[in-house]
Amino acid sequence: SQVSQNCHNGSYEISVLMMGNSAFAEPLKNLEDAVNEGLEIVRGRLQNAGLNVTVNATFMYSDGLIHNSGDCRSSTCEGLDLLRKISNAQRMGCVLIGPSCTYSTFQMYLDTELSYPMISAGSFGLSCDYKETLTRLMSPARKLMYFLVNFWKTNDLPFKTYSWSTSYVYKNGTETEDCFWYLNALEASVSYFSHELGFKVVLRQDKEFQDILMDHNRKSNVIIMCGGPEFLYKLKGDRAVAEDIVIILVDLFNDQYFEDNVTAPDYMKNVLVLTLSPGNSLLNSSFSRNLSPTKRDFALAYLNGILLFGHMLKIFLENGENITTPKFAHAFRNLTFEGYDGPVTLDDWGDVDSTMVLLYTSVDTKKYKVLLTYDTHVNKTYPVDMSPTFTWKNSKLPNDITGRGPQ
């Protein structure tokens, strides 16, 4: 039902859902710190623009009695319970930040009259695509899918001269929330990825994956999986791998690959890692010093959510427009705003655009090197290394079908 918003007369409130079930196991205190840091920046920006207004955040905690799995499995009802709590207390702000779980975001969007914007650090699944008042500040599955299709089709790069049309996808059900939805999108028979590929099989057992590595009758040389190098090692170990196998390891929210002293282990030589371009200024931030790389991205998304709200608030106030209107609720898209770590671009559907980076392991230096970048905003690939020192024959990626390319 319609809830009155604390969002007028020079006082603007942000409702932050602090859910026990979260896309990343992040102490809520860290997210609070991120939000508070964002508020300080927003207040400064509004003051500099000559706007004398108050901006605050209200943190809404769930009781944690019923919904206590800690991951996203029991998040569906937790989000709705929190909304009910907000409704009963008549404490809705101008904008809702959180939830991060796809299940809860989807359900909340479905079951409420959303006349206010909703900003999510997560909600990766395809079911949260194209929602008119939802903004997602971490790369959703759709963006990954578009990269993969683009890369599969590409055949005019110095190091990739074959179009691919086949793939195995490894998905064993133990994935993190981001990986779960990324792989779910690749698995879905109605998805763009499935539609564009001629052959795709999901491997669900460790043994299935391990057998494919040396199976002469395999239907594809390409295997997509999601996780970090350690996850791959647990699965693959030091097993021999056919020389034309290419493993694509999706590890978007991990910038360890860019650290100076990192050496790629030997088991990564057949692997292309897909990650996001690293942030640079977060490392010195007060709220992020003790965070792992993944959690930095999660906390940063909360912080950027606050900055996004501040950006929109400033625009509407400068134009003398009302904040509690459908126009404001639908405005959080198709724009670029000043994020904590530089400009942040949102697409027409409110999803963050980013630069994905494909890395390979140099056989010369045993370092991760950038092969190409991909700009999700324009769906374009930019080759970076013209002569990669690959493990694959002729320093070119093999064909995806055994027997057609180098074997």
């Epitope: 970048t373 930019y382 013209m386 002569s387």
Partner: antibody, heavy 118, light 110 residues
Framework: EVQLVQPGAEVKKPGSSVKVSCKAS????????ISWVRQAPGQGLEWMGR????????NYAQKFQGRVTITADKSTSTAYMELSSLRSEDTAVYFC???????????WGQGTLVTVSS | QSGLTQPASVSGSPGQSITISCTGT?????????VSWYQQHPGKAPKLMIY???NRPSGVSNRFSGSKSGNTASLTISGLQAEDEADYYC??????????FGTGTKLTVL
């Protein structure tokens, strides 16, 4: 539509350094490369190096290796080219340019004339 | 890396076609389909005319076309016009992931 804005001119003494800026207005530096190209009076174009701002990856022409440093500040969408140990033959117009595809520089700055003279 | 080799000058009458060559090695022109061509009028910044051997950016006349054979790339301008008079440069990537320009060709429209 992105434009690259450069300062008009710089006068430097031999042996000193120059740092030329290149600001993207109407857009960001994004994931593409920014190249630096120079042109001495009456001469051809000479590629000096490039940076991919979002990653900080640089490549330099062998001729300038050790003498040129290209950097970028993502937060201000500005790229910089610093050339050290200047000599009179470094007198040239220095252009920055964006390449959306390798070696395809589709947007150019207006150029900065650097004069090296004692 | 010294520049790619181009003829110093080329001329033609209005309405005619001319071709400018750009010769490199298998480590640059011959090795990659990343050859570009630029037009530069005196005192102005260069303008991209052709990229990736034969693609034209939007806004560039279809009188300009590009091709490549082995280690040599070519720019052809058909139906020459007075405003085509300018300097033309080719460029490409190298196996070191650097770029290199051609020596430049002065086009005179007679």
């Amino acid at each position: 539509e992105v434009q690259l804005v450069q300062p008009g001119a710089e006068v430097k003494k031999p042996g000193s350094s120059v740092k030329v800026s290149c600001k993207a207005s109407g857009g960001t530096l994004s994931s593409y490369a920014i190249s630096w190209v120079r042109q001495a009076p009456g001469q051809g174009l000479e590629w000096m190096g490039r940076i991919i701002p979002i990653l900080g990856i640089t490549n330099y022409a062998q001729k300038f290796q050790g003498r040129v440093t290209i950097t970028a500040d993502k937060s201000t969408s500005t790229a910089y080219m610093e050339l050290s140990s200047l000599r009179s033959e470094d007198t040239a117009v220095y252009f920055c340019a964006r390449d959306q595809r390798p070696a395809s520089m589709d947007v150019w700055g207006q150029g900065t004339l650097v004069t090296v003279s004692s | 890396q010294s520049g790619l080799t181009q003829p110093a000058s080329v001329s033609g009458s209005p309405g005619q076609s001319i071709t400018i060559s750009c010769t490199g090695t298998s480590s640059d022109v011959g090795g990659y389909n990343y050859v570009s061509w630029y037009q530069q009028h005196p005192g102005k910044a260069p303008k991209l005319m052709i990229y990736e051997v034969s693609n034209r950016p939007s806004g560039v006349s279809n009188r300009f076309s590009g091709s490549k054979s082995g280690n040599t790339a070519s720019l052809t301008i058909s139906g020459l016009q007075a405003e085509d008079e300018a300097d033309y440069y080719c460029s490409t990537v190298t196996s070191l992931s650097t770029y290199v320009f051609g020596t430049g060709t002065k086009l005179t429209v007679l």
